[in-house]
């Protein structure tokens, strides 16, 4: 049977070194806040990742900017609040030498 | 000033469990093959990642599917040759129990 | 405890501009919302807008965009509206509220008249 | 937007009298995933400000008599009275905070 085989240029495309999608928890992006809640506890960024055809390579930001969100901080006894949180996203990626 | 700000129910939905595209090495899914090298060392598969809203649940795949992919296997002292490998990606994701 | 002193009432005449003060006491006026609430004579409530104090970030109701601005002094904890061009579809008595998605506390509201 | 529609606009009952109002939006208010609805009651006496008496559509504010009962998911919601005493004289608002904030009309209650 003809299964659909996904062709080296594509694979290599989609695996190359760029900005993809992370859930990322909160918590390890606001350290200070352990004590507290968030709903939601992870919020989805933009990071570099893949690979570099080259293993003397890595994949590293270029660019940043920075995303702010609105969540849920579930405080002791209280209800919840809405506060506005901001996150760096990685916008640009390139692969650089691992010793830079 | 009005910054954009991504609303929290916008933040909830791309924060919540779901198959997300993943950059995986090849070697993690065919330990077998460590002693060789693939070219890309990485391939893009759909994984269930993301937050569930309740610490009692985690999310998990509840239907998955195989994609077979074209690679480059080098092999020492040989010229690479095109391989196929078969990986399973997640489809549908759920959250569910931690403990089922 | 929590309260949020708002300004005093306020007779104005058409096409002039007022600014309504509400200061913020009891609580660290940087973690949460402030709410802006208009209640018109013979109407129900509206949402106006909000400002995030602890960034100074902004989001109106559509139907108040260039009628209504909000500012804050983090300094001494005040929220502030101004509203410009008045019409007599401005009289009305505003309330400041905090929090958000639930609003918990509000002001005592100002009454805002526009006569000529 | 999201438009919520109270009924009756205003009511009279006895003291002592269950009443019930009702709010329906004009899209769902629930987050699946939090299995939460962003809605609230507010309950408004002549010549006072607004007071929160029930969010997530079910959940009593702290000091709030257990005579007010939220309940309702998704699009059609309820708050009830069981036994309405002469202080809860005032304007019921229903509030969405699913996508920024509106209030419903309001229902007026008074005494007999």
């Known amino acids: 049977s003809e299964v659909e085989v996904v062709p080296f240029q594509e694979v290599w495309g989609r695996s190359y070194c760029r900005a993809l999608e992370r859930l990322v928890d909160v918590v390890s992006e606001y350290p200070s806040e352990v004590e507290h809640m968030f709903s939601p506890s992870c919020v989805s960024l933009l990071r570099c990742t893949g690979c570099c055809g080259d293993e003397n390579l890595h994949c590293v930001p270029v660019e940043t900017a920075n995303v702010t969100m609105q969540l849920l901080k579930i405080r002791s006894g209280d209800r919840p609040s809405y506060v506005e949180l901001t996150f760096s996203q990685h916008v640009r990626c390139e692969c650089r030498p691992l010793r830079e | 000033s009005e910054v954009e700000v991504v609303p929290f129910q916008e933040v909830w939905g791309r924060s919540y469990c779901r198959a997300l595209e993943r950059l995986v090495d090849v070697v993690s899914e065919y330990p077998s093959e460590v002693e060789h090298m693939f070219s890309p060392s990485c391939v893009s598969l759909l994984r269930c990642t993301g937050c569930c809203g309740d610490e009692n649940l985690h999310c998990v795949p509840v239907e998955t599917a195989n994609v077979t992919m074209q690679l480059l296997k080098i092999r020492s002292g040989d010229r690479p040759s095109y391989v196929e490998l078969t990986f399973s990606q997640h489809v549908r994701c759920e959250c569910r129990p931690l403990r089922e | 405890q929590v309260q949020l002193q708002q300004s005093g009432a306020e007779l104005v005449k058409p096409g002039a501009s007022v600014k309504i003060s509400c200061k913020a006491s009891?609580?660290?006026?940087?973690?949460?919302?402030i709410n802006w609430v208009k209640l018109a004579p013979g109407q129900g409530l509206e949402w106006i807008g909000w400002?995030?104090?602890?960034?100074?970030?902004?989001k109106y109701n559509e139907k108040f965009k260039g009628k209504a601005t909000l500012t804050i002094d983090t300094s001494s904890s005040t929220a502030y509206m101004q509203l410009s061009s008045l019409t007599s579809e401005d009289t009305a008595v505003y309330f400041c509220?905090?929090?958000?998605?639930?609003?918990?506390?509000w002001g005592q509201g100002t009454l805002l008249t526009v006569s000529s | 937007d999201i438009v919520l529609t109270q009924s009756p606009d205003s009511l009279a009952v006895s003291l002592g009298e269950r009443v019930t109002m009702n709010c329906k939006s004009s899209?769902?208010?629930?987050?699946?995933?939090?299995?939460?609805?962003?809605l609230a009651w507010y309950q408004q006496k002549p010549g006072q400000s607004p007071k929160l008496l029930i969010y997530?559509?079910?959940t009593r504010e702290s000091g709030v008599p257990d005579r007010f009962t939220g309940s309702g998911s998704g699009t059609d919601f309820t708050l009830t009275i069981s036994s309405v005493q002469a202080e809860d004289v005032a304007v019921y608002y229903c509030?969405?905070?699913?996508?920024?904030?509106?209030f419903g009309s309001g229902t007026k209650l008074e005494i007999k």
């Open positions: 509220v905090r929090d958000s998605p639930f609003f918990d506390y």
């Open positions: 009891g609580y660290t006026f940087t973690d949460y919302y």
């Open positions: 997530w559509a079910s």
């Open positions: 400002i995030y104090p602890g960034s100074g970030n902004t």
């Open positions: 899209q769902s208010l629930l987050n699946s995933g939090m299995r939460k609805s962003f």
């Open positions: 509030k969405q905070s699913y996508h920024l904030f509106t």
